[in-house]
């Protein structure tokens, strides 16, 4: 059972969709650019991305601080139950913008802005990222991270936008964890029905990479659930 708005939207967002992404950024002053493309099934909650560092490679910091900006930011691919309005799918064809602050436990800060649009039947993502204050001997600059644990983003409406909050955990090579508090504001470019509060359960994996992480492939599975749902499904 889908609403009229979501029915109309299914004509715009197909069962299978591609995307292109361009990121420009700097981390502790090191400037870089990344180009990528991806594909996935928006109504099933799965997507893959192939990404290439086109300027500034090899990167002198851990890829893991970039990976969520391509996937956790590719929100049209989140599976939603019929009774939760899919705010970000409904924003198309106009699309949406988002901005994010990631505060890491050692004082590192990453800010991200992203513009999502639809051109010729493909999603187009323009991303800007800035990372500062990462200690030179810390896990990011020493490349000691080993990917993100599965996480749950708490979504809620506020001031005409959709807010997301996550406590994210990076796995470390020594077996420990490195934590980040992540806050994102998503805003459609046109008036769209906002959902109530719910959770998006997310699992992001690096599926392949070359030795210096200048070519990386990622896979993500993401599903919206009422606030009581667990994360077991992500591991199936």
């Amino acid at each position: 059972m889908v609403s009229k708005g979501e029915e109309d939207n299914m004509a715009i967002i197909k069962e299978f969709m591609r995307f292109k992404v361009h990121m420009e950024g700097s981390v502790n002053g090191h400037e870089f650019e990344i180009e990528g493309e991806g594909e996935g099934r928006p109504y099933e909650g799965t997507q893959t991305a192939k990404l290439k560092v086109t300027k500034g490679g090899p990167l002198p910091f851990a890829w893991d601080i970039l990976s969520p900006q391509f996937m956790y930011g590719s929100k049209a691919y989140v599976k939603h139950p019929a009774d939760i309005p899919d705010y970000l799918k409904l924003s198309f064809p106009e699309g949406f913008k988002w901005e994010r602050v990631m505060n890491f436990e050692d004082g590192g800060v990453v800010t991200v802005t992203q513009d999502s649009s639809l051109q010729d039947g493909e999603f187009i993502y323009k991303v800007k990222l800035r990372g500062t204050n990462f200690p030179s001997d810390g896990p990011v600059m020493q490349k000691k991270t080993m990917g993100w644990e599965a996480s749950s983003e708490r979504m809620y409406p506020e001031d005409g936008a959709l807010k997301g909050e996550i406590k994210q955990r990076l796995k470390l090579k020594d077996g420990g964890h490195y934590d980040a508090e992540v806050k994102t504001t998503y805003k459609a470019k046109k008036p769209v029905q906002l959902p109530g509060a719910y959770n998006v359960n997310i699992k992001l994996d690096i599926t392949s990479h070359n030795e210096d992480y200048t070519i990386v492939e990622q896979y993500e599975r993401a599903e919206g659930r009422h606030s009581t749902g667990g994360m077991d499904e992500l591991y199936k």
């Epitope: 901005e99 602050v101 800010t111 802005t113 513009d115 936008a161």
Partner: nanobody
């Protein structure tokens, strides 16, 4: 180029309220932030509150629950509503603006006002 003009500062009793205003003129980037900072004698300039173009808010721990930042887009004005003020809130308050990356979570805003004095007695 963005110009910022603050107003609303003055003398206020402890426990009282005050509303600061900042009128902005000029063009803004697609992702921007407006912020209030403050500086008291002998101390560094510190973030009080920031508001982004998409509506994200960022408050200093010391003012959470007491101060509210808001924007009236039609008037190009950002406000700082200060409630339940105390002596530690005495400072020169600066309005600032800039790109989201420089001004929302960092102190490197592109544009600054001249400042308005707030004194709590």
């Amino acid at each position: 180029q963005v110009q910022l003009v603050e107003s609303g500062g003055g003398l206020v009793q402890a426990g009282g309220s005050l509303r600061l205003s900042c009128v902005a003129s000029g063009s803004a980037p697609s992702f921007f932030a407006m912020a209030w900072y403050r500086q008291s004698p002998g101390n560094e300039r510190e973030l009080v509150a920031a508001l982004s173009s998409l509506g994200s808010t960022n408050y200093a721990d010391s003012v959470k629950g007491r101060f509210t930042i808001s924007m009236d887009n039609a008037k190009n004005t950002v406000y700082l509503q200060m409630n339940n003020v105390n002596a530690e809130d005495t400072a020169v308050y600066y309005c600032a603006a800039g790109d989201f990356h420089s001004c929302y979570a960092r102190k490197s805003c592109d544009y600054w006002g001249q400042g308005t004095q707030v004194t709590v007695s």
